[in-house]
């Protein structure tokens, strides 16, 4: 049952190994003078740590009770530098009456399985077999820090060795590095740096723009309070321990400023009374945008030059300007703010609204039945439309016929040069209600007040017209 037997017989010391009286064997190159380390528990939380002695219930042929089984004492504490190799051992002498004995290695309460360099060697004698379990790690890393133990199962008893503390030492390792910040000019702020060994302690020096800030080191963790900056600076920290120095990343501390003005203000859509714009935000000045202001000036030389201001959120970078005059020219600029203040206004752009619909209805609408009784004659006066309504393109006539509970609305379109129209009688013995609206490219204006005329049955004629008075006429 010997897996490897490079040396003759245990318990004499193995060549090339260090044996500390009756402790476990240890092969440890280059370990002198190394300092302390981070170590973890050899037990699992909530799990009792089994003692390392098992009292066999079996007696030998001569019926004498066997001595308690126990691992020999271990070396205790191995200290070495990162990237070195280490080998350590557990040893136990087991009476030959025990057959199947297996030794497992555990680190910090977890069994070490898989690709670990563990070798168990058996050295049989007349009455006992000396078992040496060796564990080797090549190029140790910090993660190899911990408490290592051997466990042996024998006759349903578990025998546990004393722990071997492996302490891997190296350059300081950062657990918290300074972070980039955006700060207000001349306002104090803190930076934090934390590094660990082993070996401890770790001392921290702060560096600003390549120059050391503190003459005396501070123990890790260190908080640097900077009373305030007037310009951008780069900070880093140096962590020192007995093994040497590690430098953190350099972090830029920016000074918050007002934003740059927005650029590329664009028109996306214009209607008679609104304009949809977008813009590209400028540099935020190391402080998030809070909101933006859209400024609108009417370009008409006759206007009073007043500026309309519309406040909006900083995102999305788009705004629909409303309540504008139709067929007007505007100059539009955008400014945005952060916690420091407002940016300058973007370059101004020109934009125009489209024609609007007429705002007034045709005047003096009159309606009467012509002599042939086949037509209704409608007359009106052209409304006094404003320039912004655009060019008149025509009129829309609504006539509603009502008779015996039945109602029917018809619409007619006539050209802009007309101020009269004739419509065919649709129903006799009925009321016809007429309304007229002016039409431009901007849309349909308001309808005039309704004018009603009664269309009698055949054979009865009434030439009296119906009309709406012109404004100002009694």
């Amino acid at each position: 049952r010997e897996e490897a037997k490079p040396y003759p017989l245990f318990p004499g010391p193995l060549p090339g190994s260090l044996q500390t009286d009756h402790t476990s064997l240890l092969s440890l190159p280059h370990t002198s003078g190394y300092q302390p380390a981070l170590m973890f528990s050899p037990t699992q939380p909530g799990r009792p740590y089994t003692g390392n002695v098992a009292i066999p219930r079996v007696t030998s042929a001569g019926s004498k009770l066997l001595p308690p089984l126990a691992f020999k004492h271990t070396v205790g504490h191995i200290i070495l530098s990162e990237h070195k190799d280490v080998k350590f051992n557990c040893s136990i002498s087991v009476p030959n009456i025990y057959q199947d004995t297996t030794i497992s290695w555990w680190k910090d309460g977890k069994e070490l399985l898989g690709a670990h360099h563990a070798i168990t060697q058996f050295y049989p004698d007349d009455e006992v077999t000396a078992i040496i379990a060796s564990f080797s790690i090549t190029s140790v890393q910090r993660s190899d820090n911990g408490s290592y133990i051997c466990k042996m199962k024998i006759n349903n008893e578990e025998i546990v060795s004393d722990p071997i503390y492996i302490e891997v030492q190296g350059l300081p390792h950062f657990t918290k590095q300074p972070e980039s910040m955006n700060v207000t000019r001349n306002t104090a702020f803190n930076l934090t740096c934390q590094a660990v060994g082993p070996p401890e302690p770790v001392n921290i020096f702060w560096v600003q723009n390549s120059s050391r800030v503190n003459e005396q080191p501070e123990k890790s963790p260190s908080v640097l309070t900077v009373p305030g900056l007037t310009e951008m600076a780069v900070f880093s920290c140096e962590a020192h321990n007995d093994k040497g120095l590690t430098v953190s990343k350099g972090v830029q501390i920016n000074i918050k400023a007002i934003p740059s003005p927005p650029t590329e203000v664009s028109i996306h859509n214009s209607t008679a009374h609104s304009i949809l714009i977008s813009w590209v935000p400028g540099f935020d000045g190391y402080s998030p945008f809070r909101n933006c202001s859209v400024q609108v000036k009417e370009v008409d030389p006759l206007s009073n030059g007043s500026v309309m201001i519309f406040n909006t959120s900083a995102s999305p970078h788009m705004y629909q300007i409303k309540q504008l005059q139709a067929l007007a020219n505007y100059s539009i600029g955008v400014s945005c703010m952060n916690e420091i203040g407002w940016s300058a206004v973007s370059p101004w752009i020109l934009a125009s609204t489209t024609e609007g619909a007429p705002s007034v209805a045709p005047l003096n609408v009159t309606v009467f039945l012509n002599e042939s009784r086949d037509n209704v004659d409608i007359r009106w006066m052209k409304p006094l439309t404003k320039r912004q309504a655009g060019e008149l393109v025509g009129y829309r006539i609504s006539h509603v016929w009502q008779s015996a509970g039945i109602s029917k609305e018809l619409l007619e379109e006539v050209g802009q040069n007309n101020s009269r129209a004739q419509i065919s009688v649709q129903v006799h013995n009925a009321t016809c209600t007429v309304r007229i609206a002016a039409v431009t490219k901007g849309g349909v204006g308001p309808f005039s007040d309704p004018v009603k005329i009664f269309i009698p049955a055949h054979g009865w004629v009434d030439h009296a017209p119906s009309s709406t008075p012109a404004p100002g006429n009694a």
Partner: antibody
Framework: QSVEESGGRLVTPGTPLTVTCTVS????????MGWVRQAPGKGLEYIGF?????NTYYASWAKGRFTISKTSTTVDLKITSPTTEDTATYFC?????????????WGPGTLVTVSL | DVVMTQTPASVEAAVGGTVTIKCQAS??????LAWYQQKPGQRPKLLIY???NLASGVPSRFAGSGSGTQFTLTISDLECADAATYYC????????????FGGGTEVVVK
């Protein structure tokens, strides 16, 4: 990295007392902590240890007389039923690792006086 | 628990001289031994751990040796500031054997 004890005071025999150790600059989930006491004019006496995962170990003489527990930043030592022999300065100390009971950082100590 | 026996209880030496303090464990503790220095009214300070490894910031005038059950602390080129009480402590398998201290050795510097 530092540790500091608090809660030491004058108590009468039999009155339970808890002494607290507050740590800063390191994590109790990585390092174990020990309690050591020193009677006036006497040597250091190991009481017990709590490792990084919360397992507690006591000197054989201290079992049943003391209870060690911890939170994320504090470690408590409870003297369950003090006697006059428990009059001492109580030190808490940071272990070298999770389960290592050598102590590389010590608190200044807190005085517990047990008297009628 | 392991019992630690420290000798002598007190030692006197002149400035520039050498002092040797011994510590014996009641059973093998490998190299899991630490040495501490304590001055009157102060907290203890770690000097050496793993029997021979100097703690950070400790002068090389302090040296530890030994393994198993016999350990030695040697202070050479003695200075007035070295006047203190020195303690050994085992931390071998602390979960099983405790973390006992030796009784202490008072060093008097003349």
């Amino acid at each position: 990295q530092s540790v500091e004890e608090s809660g030491g005071r004058l108590v009468t025999p039999g009155t339970p007392l808890t002494v607290t150790c507050t740590v800063s600059g390191f994590s109790l989930s990585v390092y174990g902590m020990g309690w050591v006491r020193q009677a006036p004019g006497k040597g250091l006496e190991y009481i017990g240890f709590i490792n990084n995962v919360g397992n507690t170990y006591y000197a054989s003489w201290a079992k049943g007389r003391f209870t060690i527990s911890k939170t994320s930043t504090t470690v408590d030592l409870k003297i369950t039923s003090p006697t006059t022999e428990d009059t001492a300065t109580y030190f808490c100390a940071k272990g070298g690792g999770g389960d290592w009971g050598y102590f590389n950082i010590w608190g200044p100590g807190t005085l517990v006086t047990v008297s009628l | 628990d392991v019992v630690m026996t420290q000798t002598p209880a007190s030692v006197e030496a002149a400035v520039g001289g050498t002092v040797t303090i011994k510590c014996q464990a009641s059973q093998s503790i490998g190299n899991a031994l630490a040495w501490y220095q304590q001055k009157p009214g102060q907290r203890p300070k770690l000097l050496i751990y793993a029997a021979s490894n100097l703690a950070s910031g400790v002068p090389s005038r302090f040296a530890g040796s030994g393994s198993g059950t016999q350990f030695t602390l040697t202070i050479s080129d003695l200075e007035c500031a070295d006047a203190a009480t020195y303690y050994c402590q085992t931390y071998y398998a602390i979960n099983r054997y405790g973390g006992a201290f030796g009784g202490g050795t008072e060093v008097v510097v003349k």
